[in-house]
């Protein structure tokens, strides 16, 4: 019976499986290209298993390999208004500590509305990262057109 | 012996790793814009290990969180067709059981031919995913151009 | 102590857990429509843990489902230049051996400067892969900008 | 299996009209998606019209409000009617029928027919 149990916890506990998916909670103040996230049941689909929000940024708690995917819709967006108001750019990167800063993901929206992409990179304990939006066009929050997470891979 | 056996069938069948791929296999009627989904091995690369189709839609076999991603291809399609037939959009989610009905993830082709995009999302045994094509343009059955996929990530 | 360490080792070594993410190092001569990768940790962010590189292309080592991941942007582009320039399309297929040449995922640029998506596939020992940019446009060499990479998901 | 023939074809002055047919012999025709490709010298080949089992129809923009696709799901034939041709039509058209059902994905493809537009 114990030993069943251990193995049922094992994945999850000893290696790893963290998991994180976010809804955009708001953006920035005026000078702040960053993206703000929340996540949990009370919000509906969301959920942060293992990794944490730290002031709206993803922090990492264990070291492995994961797989970043983001999508973010522009909210009052055609073709026209994006190539309008071009650039406007997407960045996913490490932010902090300020020694593994380094850009992950970064998608320019041209004449579409959505950018979606993913990507697999090694992230360690107490990285936290950050999602900049540069340009003057804002994000959507429904939670099926902007979100953000984060899934463990391996060691 | 026993034990071995016992290790390496654990985490298909008691912790899921259930995956399904699937390609186009039609459109619906004229007022249903639901796509309609094949998967097997005569079909080339597509594949159901765990989940199943119910009508040409995808119902999830295990609780879990999942990965669900997708690509779409409109069959005929310049800039100037996408723009000119806009909008036409594509939305995932559950839509049945009714309690359960929700948008996963929703794009709109603006002046592209392609939408691809995947998130991670809590599915419940009894799941049924449905996959939305709004507007008038068709989508390719290329299955290199146009297939629809999940995969078990964790309890 | 000595089942701890079997357990551990389980899911890497048994089970495979093989991973890889490149980045572009050059693209191929004239009439070679194929993207030429690199990885490993002295040149950032890139790896592999299984598959291997021959001659630039990502070659197989152990079988089983796996998801299939690229981003690719254009270096000097705007949607200007992509829809001058159309048709600029990537394919990523299994190149050899050529009883098993297929082609996996394509998409075309239209009016946008980035293409991204991704794909579950099975993939057998031995198979190489190889990612086609077809058109006169050059990929951008920025490691975030341009990637391409495999994890394995179940046998 | 399914055999697909194209008829039609030939040399139209520009701004003229041609009617090209494509007959479908084999089960199930009204669930194919069938459509006409073209193949000018040079070029890709190019979807020009699409329709599916139901009637629905897609165009590529260079052919729109020109050409129609059409089907007689009774005759087991596919039509493209083709008016206000320009030197640009020309082409070899082919006849595409994108089986849906059944235990597999299977396409068919007719020999084509030549369509030349002089200005």
């Known amino acids: 019976q114990r030993f069943a149990q251990a193995q049922q916890q094992l994945p999850l506990e000893s290696l790893g499986w963290d998991v994180a998916e976010l809804q955009l909670n708001h953006t920035g103040p005026q000078q702040d290209p960053r993206l703000y996230w929340q996540g949990g049941p009370a919000l509906g689909r969301s959920f942060l298993h293992g990794p944490e929000l730290d002031k709206g940024q993803l922090r990492i708690h264990r070291d492995g390999i994961y797989m970043v995917h983001i999508q973010v819709t522009l909210a009052i967006c055609s073709s026209t208004t994006a190539s309008r108001h071009h650039p406007t750019t997407l960045a996913v990167g490490i932010c902090s500590p300020a020694s593994r800063s380094i850009s992950l993901l970064r998608l320019s929206f041209h004449q579409g509305c959505t950018i979606a992409s993913q990507r697999l990179t090694p992230l360690a304990r107490g990285d936290t990262l950050c999602t900049n939006l540069t340009g003057t066009l804002l994000p959507s929050r429904n939670t099926d057109e902007t979100f953000f997470g984060v899934q463990w891979v391996r060691p | 012996q026993r034990f071995a056996q016992a290790q390496q069938q654990l985490p298909l069948e008691s912790l899921g790793w259930d995956v399904a791929e699937l390609q186009l296999n039609h459109t619906g009627p004229q007022q249903d814009p639901r796509l309609y989904w094949q998967g097997g091995p005569a079909l080339g690369r597509s594949f159901l290990h765990g989940p199943e189709l119910d009508k040409g839609q995808l119902r999830i076999h295990r609780d879990g969180i999942y990965m669900v991603h997708i690509q779409v291809t409109l069959a005929i399609c310049s800039s100037t067709t996408a723009s000119r037939h806009h909008p036409t959009t594509l939305a995932v989610g559950i839509c049945s059981p009714a309690s359960r009905s929700i948008s996963l993830l929703r794009l709109s082709f603006h002046q592209g031919c392609t939408i691809a995009s995947q998130r991670l999302t809590p599915l419940a045994r009894g799941d049924t995913l449905c996959t939305n094509l709004t507007g008038t343009l068709l989508p390719s059955r290329n299955t290199d151009e146009t297939f629809f996929g999940v995969q078990w990530v964790r309890p | 102590q000595r089942f701890a360490q079997a357990q551990q080792q389980l899911p890497l070594e048994s089970l495979g857990w093989d991973v890889a993410e490149l980045q572009l190092n050059h693209t191929g001569p004239q009439q070679d429509p194929r993207l030429y990768w690199q990885g490993g940790p002295a040149l950032g962010r890139s790896f592999l843990h299984g598959p291997e590189l021959d001659k630039g292309q990502l070659r197989i080592h152990r079988d089983g489902i796996y998801m299939v991941h690229i981003q690719v942007t254009l270096a000097i582009c705007s949607s200007t230049t992509a829809s001058r320039h159309h048709p600029t399309t990537l394919a990523v297929g299994i190149c050899s051996p050529a009883s098993r040449s297929i082609s996996l995922l394509r998409l075309s640029f239209h009016q946008g400067c980035t293409i991204a998506s991704q794909r579950l596939t099975p993939l057998a020992r031995g198979d190489t892969l190889c990612t086609n940019l077809t058109g006169t446009l050059l990929p951008s060499r920025n490691t975030d900008e341009t990637f391409f990479g495999v994890q394995w998901v179940r046998p | 299996e399914v055999q697909v023939v194209e008829s039609g074809g030939g040399m139209v002055q520009a701004g003229g009209s041609l009617r090209l047919s494509c007959a479908a012999s084999g089960k199930r025709f009204s669930f194919y998606f069938m459509g006409w490709y073209r193949q000018a010298p040079g070029k890709q080949r190019e979807l020009v019209a699409l329709?599916?089992?139901?009637?629905?129809?897609n165009y590529a923009g260079s052919v729109e409000g020109r050409f129609t696709i059409s089907r007689d799901n009774a005759k087991n034939t596919l039509y493209l009617q083709m008016n206000s041709m320009k030197p640009e039509d020309t082409a070899v058209y082919y006849c595409?029928?994108?089986?849906?059902?059944?235990?597999?994905?299977?396409?068919?493809w007719g020999q084509g027919t030549q369509v030349s537009v002089s200005s």
């Open positions: 329709i599916t089992g139901d009637g629905r129809t």
């Open positions: 595409y029928a994108d089986a849906f059902a059944g235990a597999g994905r299977d396409e068919y």
